[in-house]
Each structure stands twice: as structure tokens, then as C-alpha cells.
């Protein structure tokens, strides 16, 4: 069971300082941006991180949403990352959900975050280069010190 708590507005970056944004095709991508680029590209660079109470404490349970014309929420259904047009629900009556991720700091580094899927144990949000694009993907990872699964989250509230 997950019960919604508060939400916060955040900018998410990979460890190469590239900013996560949602492009016109609704794809989550990372790109080099100055602070002013980041502001100019809002709301596509501003993510709503909603925190949830978890009936089985396993870290901070969150959803990641973005509000452009409508609210879309990040999903890892079938291990594929996509934004689905939906509001983060108030309650989820299950111990796993394709839209719930566990946000945890990297040991010894409170500013570096990992996001593990609640649906797929050992699968993490990651930044992966594909041709010329830096994409947000779900990655099965047993190399937990890999920088591709680490992010910084900067609160914008």
C-alpha cells in the first residue's frame, strides 16, 4: 500500500550535470543546459516528485511527474520508461507499482540519488547514450557504483 504525502518541484540532473527534460515527443532526455536554459525550458525541466508513505518501509517511495499541457507520470511498465498521461494517485493498493520508485541516497553521498523500481527489484533509472541522445531508461544493474544510475535532485520550491 502506498499513500500520497507531499510533493515538491525539482530539477533532476545526471552526474555529468545534464538536465532531465521531457521533449516534444514526451521522451525523457538529458541535455547540457545553463541555468537560464533550464528556466527557459520550464515546465519541461521541472519535475513534480510526489512522496508516498509505504506500508513496507523500503526507502522514500516517489512518483515523478511533469506538467506541460497535462500531467504525465513516469512509468516503467514492462521495463520500458515512458510518461503516461495521469495524475499521481492518492493511494495505490499494492506493494509494487510501475509508477513508484524508491529514491535513496548513495551511501556517504547525501546529494547523489538512485531510483529503484518498486516493480522490478534491482532495476534502476539510468542515463544511457543512444546515438546522439542521452535517454532516461530502466536498467538492470548489479554495479551499484555505476555513475549512470546516480542523479542529483535540486528542489525548486
Amino acid at each position: 500500500y502506498f499513500g500520497k504525502l507531499e510533493s515538491k518541484l525539482s530539477v533532476i540532473r545526471n552526474l555529468n550535470d545534464q538536465v532531465l527534460f521531457i521533449d516534444q515527443g514526451n521522451r525523457p532526455l538529458f541535455e547540457d543546459m545553463t541555468d537560464s536554459d533550464c528556466r527557459d525550458n520550464a515546465p519541461r525541466t521541472i519535475f513534480i516528485i510526489s512522496m508516498y508513505k509505504d506500508s513496507q518501509p523500503r526507502g522514500m517511495a516517489v512518483t515523478i511527474s511533469v506538467k506541460c499541457e497535462k500531467i504525465s507520470t513516469l512509468s516503467c511498465e514492462n521495463k520500458i520508461i515512458s510518461f503516461k498521461e495521469m495524475n499521481p494517485p492518492d493511494n495505490i493498493k499494492d506493494t509494487k507499482s510501475d509508477i513508484i520508485f524508491f529514491q535513496r541516497s548513495v551511501p556517504g553521498h547525501d546529494n547523489k540519488m538512485q531510483f529503484e523500481s518498486s516493480s522490478y527489484e534491482g532495476y534502476f533509472l539510468a542515463c544511457e547514450k543512444e546515438r546522439d541522445l542521452f535517454k532516461l531508461i530502466l536498467k538492470k544493474e548489479d554495479e551499484l557504483g555505476d555513475r549512470s544510475i546516480m542523479f542529483t535532485v535540486q528542489n525548486e520550491d
Epitope: 523500503r58 526507502g59 535513496r104 548513495v106 551511501p107 534491482g122 548489479d142 554495479e143 557504483g145
Partner: antibody, heavy 126, light 107 residues
């Protein structure tokens, strides 16, 4: 309790290949990997590589990558490690081990080598 | 590759002594460090994971500490059955690397 049972000792000639098996018995959760580690006489533990039974993807230590092949047969829950072009320095005890997630009180994941096979002595001698 | 420098390579101590073994990583390994004990003719056994978390069934005289690049295994009061070889292993990045090992002997 998971147990790993390895194949028996082998004596091989230089230049030959050896294939060591590692069978899982007992209940094992998903999301684990098989790793292979060896210990040469008078030396320390040395990591050789790992295989993911879910998709058969492998990662090998650089010094073995041209000579080692790790495979897995999900139907029999058995992992295999084949080492080719054997030389006397490959005389060692070879271990298989499972690599899986343990969690701390906040749910943070840590991979550990928890279950180990009994070891297989491979002797390379002319 | 991440290098793990373990010291001492051997130690001889008496029953009841406090024994400390250290591992120094060549880069930050984020506490993705495990400690193993190996006795002659046996497979290694997990003692500590996540740098400081005691594996179930391991006596509480064993403890681990450290973060970043510096890690320590401590045996607070040495017992005869603690004789054997001890290894640290970094699990942060591939290739995984063990320390060179520490041979612990009871005087």
C-alpha cells in the same frame, strides 16, 4: 537454504580446456547472478567474471576474457565456467557463488556473494 | 580498475586480542564493500556487507566500518576459531576486486 554443488576435481594438460559446473539446489529467488572466483595455491581470491541467468549477459575480468566462457542452463539451474588454453598457472580451486541483493534497514541495496560452491580443484600439469 | 590494498598481509595474535584489518580502495566505493573469512579447504564465508552490516549468524565480535576509500574489519576479542584468511571485496564497479588477503594466526 540455497546450496551450490560443483563438479569434481579435474587434471588437465597444458593447452586443454576445462568446464566446471555449479548446480543450485534449494529455493533461490530471482534477481541473482552467478560469479566465478578462483584461488591459486599460496595466492588470494581472484574474481573471474559473472553471468546473469535472466539474459545470459556476462562480464569478465580483463585477464580472462579471451579464455573464459560462462554459461547457464535455466532448465537445470546449473551454471558453467569453461577455461581454455590452460597453463600451469591456472592450477587453482574454482568457486561459483551467487551474487544477490541484501538490504539495510532503509531498503538500500547491497550485492553480496552469499552462497558458495564447495570448490573444484583444477590441476594443470604435463 | 579499482585497486584494493589490504593490510597487514599476515597477523599473529592471542586469544582475547583485538585485531584490525584495513582495506584502502583506489577510489570511492560508496560502502559497497564486503568482508569474507576463508578457512583451509573451505569456501569463503560472508562476514560483513555494506561496509558495516553483520551477516546473520556471524558473531558480534566481528564489526566493519569505513566509507569512501577507507575500510576496516575489527575482531574485538579473538577466538581460536577465527584463524584463517580474510578478504575485502569491492562491489562498486566491475571488474570486482579483492584485497590481497590477510592470514590471521593464533599465537
Amino acid at each position: 537454504q540455497v546450496q551450490l554443488v560443483q563438479s569434481g576435481a579435474e587434471v588437465k594438460k597444458p593447452g586443454a580446456s576445462v568446464k566446471v559446473s555449479c548446480k543450485v539446489s534449494g529455493e533461490i529467488s530471482t534477481g541473482y547472478y552467478f560469479h566465478w572466483v578462483r584461488r591459486r595455491p599460496g595466492k588470494g581470491l581472484e574474481w573471474m567474471g559473472r553471468i546473469d541467468p535472466e539474459d545470459d549477459s556476462t562480464k569478465y575480468a580483463e585477464r580472462f576474457k579471451d579464455r573464459v566462457t560462462m554459461t547457464e542452463d535455466t532448465s537445470t539451474d546449473t551454471a558453467y565456467m569453461e577455461l581454455s588454453s590452460l597453463r600451469s598457472e591456472d592450477t587453482a580451486v574454482y568457486y561459483c557463488t551467487t551474487w544477490r541483493i541484501y538490504r539495510d534497514s532503509s531498503g538500500r541495496p547491497f550485492y553480496v556473494m552469499d552462497a558458495w560452491g564447495q570448490g573444484t580443484l583444477v590441476t594443470v600439469s604435463s | 580498475d579499482i585497486q584494493m590494498t589490504q593490510s597487514p598481509s599476515s597477523v599473529s595474535a592471542s586469544v582475547g586480542d583485538r585485531v584490525t584489518i584495513t582495506c584502502l580502495a583506489s577510489e570511492d566505493i560508496y560502502t559497497y564493500l564486503t568482508w569474507y573469512q576463508q578457512k583451509p579447504g573451505k569456501a569463503p564465508q560472508l562476514l560483513i556487507y555494506g561496509a558495516n552490516k553483520l551477516q546473520d549468524g556471524v558473531p558480534s565480535r566481528f564489526s566493519g566500518s569505513g566509507s569512501g576509500t577507507d575500510y576496516t574489519l575489527t575482531i574485538s576479542s579473538l577466538q581460536p576459531e577465527d584463524e584463517g584468511d580474510y578478504y575485502c571485496l569491492q562491489g562498486s564497479k566491475f571488474p570486482l576486486t579483492f584485497g590481497q588477503g590477510t592470514k590471521l594466526e593464533i599465537k
